[in-house]
Interface confidence: low
């Protein structure tokens, strides 16, 4: 059965997933997808890393930790009830059927109190390469290398004020962790 994690509407959700690189900087590709882990790859990919960089991510989904050390925990920004469900963290270890798969269940609870509406922060000043998306829907993605000359979608990421590092630390020990090598 899946490990269950909870968050309230409007909060950031944190889904822990870790591996230990065989050697420092010797990274393994990882994908995160919405839905249980299929036989291969990830379904409905929301974020992907390769041996050097995060090379694909979608709006509201980002890596908060140091993925160069194997912390590939997923942060989902400003969750809604629609974000509930199973998420797959797949550590794509080279070799046939070597992948490590972790299914994590996210349960979103209604907010205890409805916060007063606030003006959306514009992240341009602090994170100008990753801007807040103005539009909505499936077009809110960024991908590098998979399509020629696509427009980079402006998304928010790595925002200090959106971090909940205490939650991250609390969940680190109970997260999915494997050792490689």
């Amino acid at each position: 059965s899946e490990v269950e994690y909870r968050a309230e509407v409007g909060q950031n959700a944190y889904l822990p997933c870790f591996y230990t690189p065989a050697a420092p900087g010797n990274l393994v590709p990882v994908c995160w997808g919405k839905g249980a882990c299929p036989v291969f790859e990830c379904g409905n990919v929301v974020l992907r890393t390769d041996e050097r960089d995060v090379n694909y991510w979608t709006s509201r989904y980002w890596l908060n930790g140091d993925f160069r050390k194997g912390d590939v925990s997923l942060t989902i920004e400003n969750v809604t009830l629609a974000d509930s469900g199973i998420y797959c963290c797949r550590i794509q270890i080279p070799g046939i059927m070597n992948d490590e798969k972790f299914n994590l269940k996210l349960v979103i609870k209604p907010a205890k109190v409805t916060p007063a509406p606030t003006r959306q922060r514009d992240f341009t000043a602090a994170f100008p390469r990753m801007l807040t998306t103005r539009g909505h829907g499936p077009a809110e993605t960024q991908t590098l290398g998979s399509l020629p000359d696509i427009n980079l979608t402006q998304i928010s990421t790595l925002a200090n004020e959106l971090r909940d590092s205490r939650l991250a630390n609390d969940l680190r020990d109970s997260g999915a962790t494997i050792r490689i090598g």
Epitope: D53, W57, F127, Q142, G145, D149, N151, L152, T157, L158
Partner: antibody, heavy 121, light 107 residues
């Protein structure tokens, strides 16, 4: 083998213009960020501008904003720095360097050899 | 802009010495700090990325560490080819900013 080669530097009068080129080989600039960094004689390193060629998103240092324009041609795997209204304080060796889109990991892992820009009357 | 305050600005050391260079960020930069080595007339070379990762091909005598907003580059046993200028850099926010540099000279 990854390589970055700058060209286009030279002597120019104050108020003049130059266009620097950064020709990349061994990798696709569309998957990276290209940065320009300069170094005045005997001084430290100063970041100037960057571009995400796959989409054209650009950023500039305040000191060059509205005077310099960074661009890229992915078909030629080349980035450019158009420098207008040049001032004496723009005199420096200009380097292009390769970086990464995911900001947390955007260290500059390959650099060109540099091209010298001298602004003097 | 985030200031990277690097110290010392220069130091004299002998071959075999342990050398430590520090950089303090004016605000949180997480682990988004790199260290570069530059020799006269040459382009900088990446040594350490993400505060503590040794870049490919860099000798293991180089190491990096982080404590809050303080970052350290250590050369465990200085070699003749290590005499150069070293720069730290934060790449957490725009503009990326460099420290002033530390020149490591022969004693």
């Amino acid at each position: 083998e990854v390589q970055l080669v700058e060209s286009g530097g030279g002597l120019v009068q104050p108020g003049g213009s130059l266009r620097l080129s950064c020709a990349a080989s061994g990798f696709n600039i569309g998957k990276h960020v290209i940065h320009w960094v300069r170094q005045a004689p005997g001084k430290g390193l100063e970041w100037v501008a960057d571009i995400v060629p796959n989409g054209g998103y650009t950023e500039y240092a305040d000191s060059v904003k509205d005077r310099f324009t960074i661009s890229a041609d992915t078909s030629k795997n080349t980035a450019y720095l158009q420098m207008n209204s040049l001032r004496a304080e723009d005199t420096a060796v200009y380097y292009c360097a390769r970086g990464y889109v995911y900001r947390m990991w955007d260290s500059f892992d390959y650099w060109g050899q540099g091209t010298l820009v001298t602004v003097s009357s | 802009d985030i200031q990277m305050t690097q110290s010392p600005s220069s130091l004299s050391a002998s071959v075999g010495d342990r050398v430590t260079i520090t950089c303090r960020a004016s605000q949180d930069v997480n682990t988004a700090v790199a260290w570069y080595q530059q020799k006269p007339g040459k382009a900088p070379k990446l040594l350490i990325y993400s505060a503590s990762f040794l870049y490919s091909g860099v000798p293991s005598r180089f190491s990096g560490s982080r404590s809050g907003t303080d970052f350290t580059l250590t050369i465990s046993s200085l070699q003749p080819e290590d005499f150069a200028t070293y720069y730290c850099q934060q790449h957490y926010t725009t503009p990326p900013t460099f420290g002033q540099g530390t020149k490591v000279e022969i004693k």
